[in-house]
Amino acid sequence: FERTRSLQDPCSNCPAGTFCDNNRNQICSPCPPNSFSSAGGQRTCDICRQCKGVFRTRKECSSTSNAECDCTPGFHCLGAGCSMCEQDCKQGQELTKKGCKDCCFGTFNDQKRGICRPWTNCSLDGKSVLVNGTKERDVVCGPSPADLSPGASSVTPPAPAREPGHSPQ
């Protein structure tokens, strides 16, 4: 079948990195500068992606593969193949149409990307707040208020170390 196809379509013999040049009796011509073909039998070469502005070149274009971009410091990739770059913010902020804005009271963001999320509501799990939340950090939930009654320890002590053959005192 491949032989038949080759006889019918001379372009199928053109390897990656070339194109089937109709202007030259369907000779396989190398892709021109700044273009590539990643598969054989192509009638045109594709224009190489240019990594401009916020985009940095991660991998140069070759005759057989497109360039790959990533984002300059202060930005991160979004989308397939880093099709977009999105601005980083500081921890305790989120990106909006108006740029980076501080998280509202009661919310936090511990990353340079993403949105501010509400602090954990410790009481939903019957626990109390051990460490208050900030713009950058979630609250830390501790034992339930009932566990904090007089005489009760707020932190469970570690089990004493046991040596073989000895009972704990």
Partner: nanobody, 123 residues
Framework: EVQLVESGGGLVQPGGSLRLSCGAS????????MFWFRQAPGKELEWVAN????????YYVDSVEGRFTISRDDAKNSLYLQMNSLRAEDTAIYYC????????????????WGQGTTVTVSS
């Protein structure tokens, strides 16, 4: 081919004005949020201003608020940045960029950038 080309940069004295232009081609300009970013020597790229599709929403970084004005002319497929009361710290390469498809609904990313135009503020 989708393309953005900036122009209008140059050398200007402190307190002076410049108007940057960005010509768009290869896409329906009126469908996209548009941006200006800048990169000062030795510093990270920073967002300067952005404008929504119909020009009704405009936002600026604090350091240029009241001095710079972003505008667009969809009939001319052009974005502008009017820069007044220029300061030495405004010296940078200024880039025009396009908001990616779905900008502000699902992300705040940009996908097409120009090559940049250089603004130097010096006496």
């Amino acid at each position: 081919e989708v393309q953005l080309v900036e122009s209008g940069g140059g050398l200007v004295q402190p307190g002076g004005s410049l108007r940057l232009s960005c010509g768009a081609s290869g896409f329906t300009f009126s469908n996209y949020w548009m941006f200006w970013f800048r990169q000062a020597p030795g510093k990270e790229l920073e967002w300067v201003a952005n404008v929504n599709q119909d020009g009704s929403e405009k936002y600026y970084v604090d350091s240029v608020e009241g001095r710079f004005t972003i505008s667009r002319d969809d009939a001319k497929n052009s974005l502008y940045l009017q820069m007044n009361s220029l300061r030495a710290e405004d010296t940078a390469i200024y880039y025009c960029a396009r908001g990616g498809e779905g900008y502000s609904d699902s992300h705040y990313g940009t996908d097409v950038w120009g090559q940049g135009t250089t603004v130097t503020v010096s006496s």
